[in-house]
């Protein structure tokens, strides 16, 4: 039975040309978290985090996604085209899979504030 | 089009290391990993490690830790692996190959390097 | 680890059958799977990846299926290139591991 849930940061913006960073939080669950798969809003592969082996970055995403911190994702030198759904996928055990929706805005305003509160979607 | 050239066959006797050369062309040599994975002559095939060219950082198979050594030159797209304590059961074609995009896969191969082992 | 039991070992088969190669993994891998081909002397070449992907240039009579612990590779009609040994690979953990192979020979 599946008991746990995905906390994300929910709806957040960022300055173009700025980094954000990407986070999801499983928690309510004793699962030990095998791999971590993140994607972009047309389900393009971002990266993945495996336990045994580390971090994949996609290569077109090399110069601009970090990995980190922990199980999250930063993301670097924001375009509008960066605008858009983000998903995390958790693969765990024994539970199985669990998914987290992260929406980003990338605004053009040297003002725009950068919010990121842990919510449940 | 992406290509992978190994280095020529080598004949090492027991004890000895060996250093095998792959050079990479037609893609961006840092974004992707370099992967080593040896075939015993009319044997399977079998991951040894795997490097990451844009960082440096390696990852190995528990039985070739201590064995096998990775490192990249990025200047000249050319990813090296080095075997030491060489024994006979280490007598194997050795094989590069170019990471997958979307995970810990082997799109592109080398051409192979057979290295022998023997006294 | 993760240990990866192909089967059969080998088949005979004529040009134009319909060949399916079986693979399974001791756990689950999601569909973090991915099939080679061998020809003698040769370096393996990617066929599959994601359990059903197919990477540029690679024919469409190849195609693969399944999720989880259990895998299929097809050839819909034998070509007289597709005679060959044919790998699956994990990759979901380290370390990562390939099946033992499957001799397609010529019947």
């Known amino acids: 039975m599946m008991t746990g849930t995905i906390e994300t940061t929910g709806n957040i913006s960022a300055k173009k040309g700025g980094s954000v960073i990407l986070q999801c939080h499983l928690s309510s669950t004793m699962a030990q978290v095998t791999q971590v798969n993140w994607e972009q809003h047309d389900h393009s592969l971002l990266a993945i985090r495996n336990a045994e082996l580390g971090w994949h970055i996609y290569p077109a995403f090399k110069d601009r996604v970090a990995p980190g911190p922990g199980l999250g994702l930063t993301l670097q030198s924001l375009t509008m085209n960066d605008t858009g759904e983000y998903f995390c996928t958790y693969h765990t055990y024994p539970d199985g899979t669990y998914r987290g929706r992260i929406f980003l805005e990338v605004l053009e305003s040297s003002v725009a504030e950068h919010s990121a509160r842990f919510q449940i979607p | 089009q992406v290509q992978l050239v190994q280095s020529g066959a080598e004949v090492k006797k027991p004890g000895a290391s060996v250093k095998v050369s792959c050079k990479a062309s037609g893609y961006t040599f840092t974004r992707y990993s370099m992967y080593w994975v040896r075939q015993a002559p009319g044997q399977g095939l079998e991951w040894i490690a795997f490097i990451d060219a844009y960082s440096g950082g390696s990852t190995y198979a528990q039985k070739f830790q201590g064995k096998a050594t990775l490192t990249v030159d990025t200047s000249i797209s050319t990813a090296y692996m080095e075997l030491s304590r060489l024994r006979s059961d280490d007598t194997a074609v050795y094989y590069c190959a170019r990471g997958g995009d979307y995970g810990w896969y082997l799109g592109v191969w080398g051409q192979g390097t057979l290295v022998t082992v023997s006294s | 680890d993760i240990q990866m039991t192909q089967s059969p070992s080998s088949l005979s088969a004529s040009v134009g059958d319909r060949v399916t190669i079986t693979c399974r993994a001791s756990q689950s891998i999601y569909s973090y799977l991915s099939w080679y081909q061998q020809k003698p002397g040769k370096a393996p070449k990617l066929l599959i990846y994601n359990a059903k992907s197919l990477p540029s240039g690679v024919p469409s009579r190849f195609s693969g299926s399944g999720s989880g612990t259990d895998f299929t590779l097809t050839i819909s009609s034998l070509q007289p290139e597709d005679f060959a040994t044919y790998y699956c690979?994990?990759?979901?953990?380290?370390?990562?591991?390939f099946g033992q192979g499957t001799k397609v020979e010529i019947k």
């Open positions: 690979q994990h990759h979901y953990g380290n370390p990562l591991t």
